[in-house]
Structure formats: structure tokens, C-alpha cells
């Protein structure tokens, strides 16, 4: 030690007083003012502490430093003097910074910057709110999920940026006078069916439902295989076709080919194609009967059954299809002689006459329609000369009383048995399928081959028999008059008809003719 010099052991942040004592530098303090042992330390004084005499003044913050302190303007303020730091209130020139002016994009989108002392706030635009995790950021308010239920129950709420809309639900429309979007929107169900806004296939009927619609198969139609009924995409097929198949138990390639064509037509059928489909079916039937092929090798009974099946099915199919035709008269004829005459009308109170090459039919229109059936009235007549091949040797079954009269007054059946078909086979049908007991009779005038003298001419119809086959019968049909090549028949029911020449040896005078017929 140098008694006159400086102590060399002074602790950090202190200076020697003499050779035996030290004092802490300004901004530092020790336990005692004079340090006499090297074990003591000088600690930084926090001039910014609450009890400190330092005052930086308003809008400023005190920052403690090693051995000293600085006064700085608080965030959001800046010194007018430009000096970044100062030591006391008298040197303080801090004033508020207008952050909004400094940085116009401070509140990003959807907010307006509002300057405050030392800071700023963002005021959100209508439809926005401050994000809790970032109070300076405006975010869209979802009015639809906020529990405010701003929309009428007939609408659904559509949130969009900064706003929302009350839109009609799908299948609904604004009530008259209501807007579509604002919160005062009120909607009602759209009837897609009557307004034509539906997508139903033409094979279906549109049914309106609340907010939607469905498509159901037309009466007499069924859903296509694998497609459910009552959907928007339901497509149906006419059951008339699907059930007109070869009769089980009859095996014929020609017949199978015919029914394959029928089924194909059924698969592709749409009501708008009714006219074409009718023509295609009759064309196919005409071809089948012109060249029956292996049908002619079937036993006679089976041929009669096939004829019965064809006549039956044809009537059903034509009745079904003709309901989709527009009003008017149609006539089609085919190479092998098949002929169709059809009249479609909204019901009128008059008689109708359908004329063909070999037959004329007359009946009252009011027979045509079932009461309560909304569709058009249809009267149809088909001449099918080719059916005669299949009906060759078909039996004639007379009512017991007619049979008895004939046996009593005639020589009886000649040796060669079966009656001869003189005319074309014709089939008559109406939109009304209840034709077993007409309120006024139908009249047929047949042109036919010459009658062999002294033979009995009978007006007959094809009665579909017990076993699905059939026979000729006269019940309900009477012969009004006959000439050499024409016969007038009157019947109280509809079916397939023809004129037969029975092998009875008629006497010169026929006293019971009128009774029989």
C-alpha cells in the first residue's frame, strides 16, 4: 500500500479515495459510503425506481442503464427537439405521434384508424368486429351463426364479407312484393310443376313438395330397372310393353323376334313418340303375320293361343299409346294389309265412323271414355288380315239355343267341319277398356270374299277362352244383313271381330234366320 497513493483493491464500479478507502462511482451504491475492504461491492442504482427523485415528465418513460438512466418518449410519442434521450422533465419535448397520418393502412381492410394519445384504435366498419387475439384487426362478423337469427324462417342466411343476405331456400321464391336478399325477405314454396321449372322426364308426372318436387311414374308405367320411383331423376317405362311377352309355353323364333322388337320399342318409348311407336308395332306385326315362319309349324291350338295373345296385347298397347296422341284422325296401312284407323278427341257428343279398305265401324263417342278419366277419348280400329293364317280351323262355339235352332232347321254341319273365315280379322278398341256391355251397340260393315250359296254367314267375335287361347263366338253379335261380298254386324261389346261362313246347308228359305242372328 502507498499511504499517499490509491488503494489497488477497489471493487468494480468504484474509485479510490486514498490508499485505504474507496467510493462507488456515480450511479452505484454500496452498504456504506466509504469502502474499506475489498469484500464490499458497488451495485447499480435504479434511478427509475418509484421512490427515485428522477422525473422524466409526461408522455415519457425512464430507462435504467448501468450507472445511469435515460428518459425516452413513450411509444406513440416523439421528441419535438429530435433528441432521442433526455435526463429530466425540463428537457422533455415529448408529444403524441398521429400514427393514423403516418400510416394510413395501419388498420388494414374493413377498419378506420382513430388516433389516441400515445396510440391509435381501429374502428371496424359495419359487419366487422375486432379480432380478440389482435385488437387492431377487423374481422367479418358471421351474422348467420352469431345467434341473432336475422332472417325469416322461410329464408336461409347467407354470410358474406361485412354483411349477410336472407335468400329464399332452393325451391322457394319471394312472396309478391318481397325482395330477395335483405333481412325483410319472406319466401314461399315454388310450385315447380305448374311453373315448368321441373326436370321431370316425360315418362313421369311432376308432384310438388315443400321446397322441392318429385317425379312419379305415370299411371300404367313403372320405374326403369334399378331406378327408384319418386325421385327427380326417375325414368319410367310403359308397363304395357313390359308385360307383352311371348306366351309362356309357346316357343317360336319368329314370335321371339317380334316380342324383342316390342320390348326394344318399350325401352326407348317416350309419350312424344306415341305416333312412331304405334307405327313401328304395327309394322312389326304386319311383317310377323306376312311371314309367320315357325309359327305355322306349331300345333293348331297353339297358333290360336298365339293369335289370342297378339290380339289381346295389341289392343292393350294401342289403347295405352293412343292416349298420348294429339287430337285428330290417323290412318296407317302396311304392305301385308294391316291397317289402323284412330280418332282422338276431347269428348264430343256424336257418333264416330272409322273407314278402312275392308271394314267400317260406327259407334257413339260417349262410349269411348270412362267417366272421370281426364284423358282424351280414343276410338280405334285395326284390320289384321294376316291373323287369318293363325286362326285357321279355330272353333266356333255357339250359344246352346242357337246351336239347337241350327240343328233343328238345317241339315247340320257338313263333313269338313270348321267354319271358313270370310273377312279380315278386325280389332276395335276404345280409351275406355270396359267394353263388355256397351250402352249402345257398335256396327261393323265387312267387305269379304263371296259367300258360297246356301252357306250360313255369321258375325263372330274372338272370345279369349279359359286357357288364354280362345274360339269364335256369336254372343252379343247379330248379323243385320248380308250380301254376296258384304255383311253388316251389330254387337253390344268390343273385341276382335270377323265374318265366318259356317258349313251349314241352308235351305232355300230360312225361316229362323232372324231368330238365330
Amino acid at each position: 500500500q502507498d499511504s499517499r497513493g490509491c488503494a489497488r483493491w477497489c471493487p468494480q464500479d468504484s474509485s479510490c479515495v486514498n490508499a485505504t478507502a474507496c467510493r462507488c462511482n456515480p450511479g452505484f451504491s454500496s452498504f456504506s459510503e466509504i469502502i474499506t475492504t475489498p469484500m464490499e461491492t458497488c451495485d447499480d442504482i435504479n434511478e427509475c425506481a418509484t421512490l427515485s427523485k428522477v422525473s422524466c415528465g409526461k408522455f415519457s418513460d425512464c430507462w435504467n442503464t448501468e450507472g445511469s438512466y435515460d428518459c425516452v418518449c413513450s411509444p406513440g410519442y416523439e421528441p419535438v427537439s429530435g433528441a432521442k434521450t433526455f435526463k429530466n422533465e425540463s428537457e422533455n419535448t415529448c408529444q403524441d405521434v398521429d400514427e393514423c397520418q403516418q400510416n394510413p393502412r395501419l388498420c388494414k381492410s374493413y377498419g378506420t384508424c382513430v388516433n389516441t394519445l400515445g396510440s391509435y384504435t381501429c374502428q371496424c366498419l359495419p359487419g366487422f368486429k375486432l379480432k380478440p387475439e389482435d385488437p387492431k384487426l377487423c374481422t367479418d362478423v358471421n351474422e348467420c351463426t352469431s345467434g341473432q337469427n336475422p332472417c325469416h324462417s322461410s329464408t336461409h342466411c347467407l354470410n358474406n364479407v361485412g354483411s349477410y343476405q336472407c335468400r329464399c331456400r332452393p325451391g322457394w321464391q319471394p312472396i309478391p312484393g318481397s325482395p330477395n336478399g335483405p333481412n325483410n325477405t319472406v319466401c314461399e314454396d315454388v310450385d315447380e310443376c305448374s311453373s315448368g321449372q321441373h326436370q321431370c322426364d316425360s315418362s313421369t308426372v311432376c308432384f310438388n313438395t315443400v321446397g322441392s318436387y318429385s317425379c312419379r311414374c305415370r299411371p300404367g308405367w313403372k320405374p326403369r330397372h334399378g331406378i327408384p320411383n319418386n325421385q327427380k331423376d326417375t325414368v319410367c317405362e310403359d308397363m304395357t310393353f313390359s308385360t307383352w311377352t311371348p306366351p309362356p309355353g309357346v316357343h317360336s323364333q319368329t314370335l321371339s323376334r317380334f316380342f324383342d322388337k316390342v320390348q326394344d320399342l318399350g325401352r326407348d318409348y317416350k309419350p312424344g313418340l306415341a305416333n312412331n311407336t304405334i307405327q313401328s308395332i304395327l309394322q312389326a306385326l304386319d311383317e310377323l303375320l306376312e311371314a309367320p315362319g315357325d309359327l305355322e309349324t306349331l300345333p293348331r291350338l297353339q297358333q290360336h293361343c298365339v293369335a289370342s295373345h297378339l290380339l289381346d296385347g295389341l289392343e292393350d298397347v294401342l289403347r295405352g299409346l293412343s292416349k298420348n296422341l294429339s287430337n285428330g284422325l290417323l290412318n296407317f296401312s302396311y304392305p301385308a294389309g294391316t291397317e289402323l284407323s284412330l280418332e282422338v278427341q276431347k269428348q264430343v257428343d256424336r257418333s264416330v265412323t272409322l273407314r278402312q279398305n275392308q271394314a267400317v265401324m260406327q259407334l257413339d263417342w260417349n262410349q269411348a271414355q270412362k267417366s272421370g278419366d281426364p284423358g282424351p277419348s280414343v276410338v280405334g280400329l285395326v284390320s289384321i288380315p294376316g291373323m287369318g293364317k293363325l286362326l285357321a280351323e279355330a272353333p266356333l262355339v255357339l250359344e246352346p239355343e242357337k246351336q239347337m235352332l241350327l240343328h233343328e232347321t238345317h241339315q247340320g254341319l257338313l263333313q269338313d267341319g270348321s267354319p271358313i273365315l270370310l273377312s279380315d280379322v278386325i280389332s276395335a278398341f276404345l280409351s275406355n277398356n270396359d267394353t263388355q256391355n256397351l250402352s249402345s251397340p257398335v256396327t261393323f260393315t265387312f267387305s269379304h270374299r263371296s259367300v258360297i250359296p246356301r252357306q250360313k254367314v255369321l258375325c263372330v267375335f274372338w272370345e279369349h277362352g279359359q286357357n288364354g287361347c280362345g274360339h269364335w263366338a256369336t254372343t252379343g253379335c247379330s248379323t243385320i244383313g248380308t250380301r254376296d261380298t258384304s255383311t253388316i254386324c251389330r254387337c253390344t261389346h268390343l273385341s276382335s271381330f270377323a265374318v265366318l261362313m259356317a258349313h251349314y246347308d241352308v235351305q232355300e228359305e230360312d225361316p229362323v234366320l232372324t231368330v238365330i242372328t
Epitope: 309362356p248 309355353g249 293361343c305 279369349h464 277362352g465 279359359q466
Partner: antibody, heavy 120, light 107 residues
Framework: EVQLVESGGGLVKPGGSLRLSCAAS????????MSWVRQAPGKGLEWVST????????YYPDSVKGRFTISRDNAKNSLYLQMNSLRAEDTAVYYC?????????????WGQGTTVTVSS | DIQMTQSPSSLSASVGDRVTITCKAS??????VDWYQQKPGKAPKLLIY???NRHTGVPSRFSGSGSGTDFTLTISSLQPEDFATYYC?????????FGGGTKVEIK
């Protein structure tokens, strides 16, 4: 005495195949149309297929069309049903039956049935 | 396809009762309807063909009637051996279709 005896049933996995046979005796087999009819457990009867007496015509409902094939061997008095792409819903007792002559066409004689189970 | 709707699906009756089962076709099938009887675990047996004709060996108490769309099987006096399930079948068109069956049980 007319007799029809089915065989060939058994357990098969979905998608698998099976061939059923029906041995006929006591009548002129080649003169009659024949059919297969099935009955699912606890359910009603369902027509499966028909073949003509000569074997050249066969008929199926949509439910089996393209998967099942009916055939016959008149020399062996036998009727067959080849079943492919089997499904769980094909599980049933399968009967073969003889048809009356058309137009009557009822099934006048039936076999005792063979059981087909389609299960994984 | 032609649907055959059979009713009732089941019935309880006593020996000696007259029992009537009906079958309704979804469209005209003329008379191409047959009736079959089936006992548990056994093959069906033909009773009536073409709506009203009794098959060989079928007792006269069984009768069938109807044509077009409505058909009836009648058992005039039920016997113990008649307790079974009865089915109708149409063979007017393909596919051949059976009714759902009527189970006749002992009361």
C-alpha cells in the same frame, strides 16, 4: 311314377359359382318344358328360369338374367342350372319342376329341392 | 311385370271351416292362374290349374274360380292335412310370378 331329384346345392362364397342338376324319371323328359323355382328362407316362391322341351328356348327374370344359365340333356333326362356371380340374396332352396303342355302350363310335378347358401 | 297380390297373408281356421284365399293380378291374365299347396320342408304341389281345373288326385273340397284379375281358391271344409301355405301363380306372361303366399294355421 314321375320323379324329379335335385342335387348340387351347397355353401359358396359371394361371387362364386355352382351347378345344380335335376334328374328326371317316370315320363318322357324330352316332351316337357322344365323350370327352376327357388324359395329363400322363410319367404315365398320365386320363378328362376324355364327351358323349352327341345332346349332351344330359355327364359329368365331380370334378377338372374346374365348370371344363371338353364340347360338340359334330353339323352340323360337331366336339367341343369349353372349359377355364376352368386349373391347373398340367391340363398334359397332350389326346386326343379315340370310343366303341363301349353296352354295349361302349370307346374304339375316338383322335386324335393336342393339348398344353396351364399355366404362369406 | 305382373304382380300377384295374395290375401290374407295368414289365417287361422278350424277343421270343417270354409276357407277362401284370393289373388289379385295387376293386369288381365285371363285364366292363366294356378294354385299350389306347400307344407313345411316339402316341395309345392299343384292343386288347381287354369283358375278352376282340379289337378289329378286333388280332393273335391278344393275349388278355384275367377278370370281377368281376381281369383279365388276355396277349401269347402278344411281338413287336418290342409294346414299349409298356399300360393297362386300367373303364367300369362314372362316373368312367371307367384303371389306372396297364404299360411293357413289351426285356430
Amino acid at each position: 311314377e314321375v320323379q324329379l331329384v335335385e342335387s348340387g346345392g351347397g355353401l359358396v362364397k359371394p361371387g362364386g359359382s355352382l351347378r345344380l342338376s335335376c334328374a328326371a324319371s317316370g315320363f318322357t323328359f324330352s316332351s316337357y318344358d322344365m323350370s327352376w323355382v327357388r324359395q329363400a328362407p322363410g319367404k315365398g316362391l320365386e320363378w328362376v328360369s324355364t327351358i323349352s322341351s327341345g332346349g332351344n328356348y330359355n327364359y329368365y327374370p331380370d334378377s338372374v338374367k346374365g348370371r344363371f344359365t338353364i340347360s338340359r340333356d334330353n339323352a340323360k333326362n337331366s336339367l341343369y342350372l349353372q349359377m355364376n356371380s352368386l349373391r347373398a340374396e340367391d340363398t334359397a332352396v332350389y326346386y326343379c319342376a315340370r310343366h303341363y303342355d301349353y296352354p295349361d302350363y302349370a307346374m304339375d310335378y316338383w322335386g324335393q329341392g336342393t339348398t344353396v347358401t351364399v355366404s362369406s | 311385370d305382373i304382380q300377384m297380390t295374395q290375401s290374407p297373408s295368414s289365417l287361422s281356421a278350424s277343421v270343417g271351416d270354409r276357407v277362401t284365399i284370393t289373388c289379385k293380378a295387376s293386369q288381365n291374365v285371363r285364366t292363366t292362374v294356378d294354385w299350389y299347396q306347400q307344407k313345411p320342408g316339402k316341395a309345392p304341389k299343384l292343386l288347381i290349374y287354369l283358375a278352376s281345373n282340379r289337378h289329378t288326385g286333388v280332393p273335391s273340397r278344393f275349388s278355384g274360380s275367377g278370370s281377368g284379375t281376381d281369383f279365388t281358391l276355396t277349401i269347402s271344409s278344411l281338413q287336418p292335412e290342409d294346414f299349409a301355405t298356399y300360393y297362386c301363380l300367373q303364367h300369362r306372361n314372362y316373368p312367371l310370378t307367384f303371389g306372396g303366399g297364404t299360411k293357413v294355421e289351426i285356430k
